[in-house]
């Protein structure tokens, strides 16, 4: 018998230092590019190998980025969000939301799944 899939949502502050090739990740989302139904938030779609984000190790594909250097990412056009990152300076503080998939097995058993992407 299969259990239902639930998600454990956690928030984290991640401080990245811009590397020679930048921050090293891609994003999707925005009011004109909804990646998740009824959510115009900004999500990480790719972590580039050997980039600043990959070397730091905390930011994951599928994470939702809530703010950049304290600036809220709600209700932004996609390109405006991209520009915000590009103009964020050398030291960049990201407030991110991780969603961890938790598999609820049959009664009496609780197993943890892999992070969702």
């Amino acid at each position: 018998m299969n259990g239902r899939v639930d998600y454990l949502v956690t928030e984290e502050e991640i401080n990245l230092t811009r590397g020679p090739s930048g921050l090293g990740f891609n994003i999707v989302g925005g009011t004109d590019q909804q990646y998740v139904s009824n959510d115009s938030g900004i999500y990480v779609s790719r972590i580039k190998e050997n980039g600043a984000a990959a070397l730091d190790g905390r930011l994951q594909e599928g994470d939702k980025i809530l703010s950049v250097n304290g600036q809220d990412l709600k209700n932004l056009l996609h390109q405006d969000a991209v520009d915000l990152f590009r103009n964020a300076g050398y030291a960049v503080s990201l407030r991110v939301q991780h969603r961890l998939q938790v598999q609820n097995g049959p009664i009496g058993h609780r197993g943890e799944g892999d992070p969702s992407g």
Epitope: L23, N26, I27, F85, R86
Partner: nanobody, 127 residues
């Protein structure tokens, strides 16, 4: 996992035209940045053209400017390369590339490292 399948290649005479298609899997195609590269025998992979997620920005190699046009149909999950005034030096395997989302760093459309999904390619021969 994104899958890219190219079609439309073939043998054409110099001065002729071809239209290549690249069909992509995935429900979020409208977030993909897409590009065409080509590789001739014994040569390095060469950037041809790129298009952003919405189709509002396009980029071309100098060697194809004014002759090739890249476009996309997000409803059909497909990107196109219209190739006119073909020359023998356009002979190559044409490969479609994609990445989900926009880089937060400087965008270098001609850099293969910008893309992490690649098709198998379609052969174009201009005689």
């Amino acid at each position: 996992e994104v899958q890219l399948v190219e079609s439309g290649g073939g043998l054409v005479q110099a001065g002729g035209s071809l239209r290549l298609s690249c069909a992509a899997s995935g429900r979020t195609f409208s977030t993909y940045e897409m590009a065409w590269f080509r590789q001739a025998p014994g040569k390095e992979r060469e950037f041809v053209a790129a298009i952003n997620w919405s189709g509002s920005s396009t980029y071309y190699a100098d060697s194809v400017k004014g002759r090739f046009t890249i476009s996309r149909d997000n409803a059909k999950n497909t990107v196109y390369l219209q190739m006119n005034s073909l020359k023998p030096e356009d002979t190559a395997v044409y490969v479609c590339a994609a990445v989900i989302g926009s880089t937060v760093d400087e965008y270098r459309p001609s850099d293969p490292l910008e893309y992490n999904y690649w098709g198998q390619g379609t052969q174009v021969t201009v005689s």
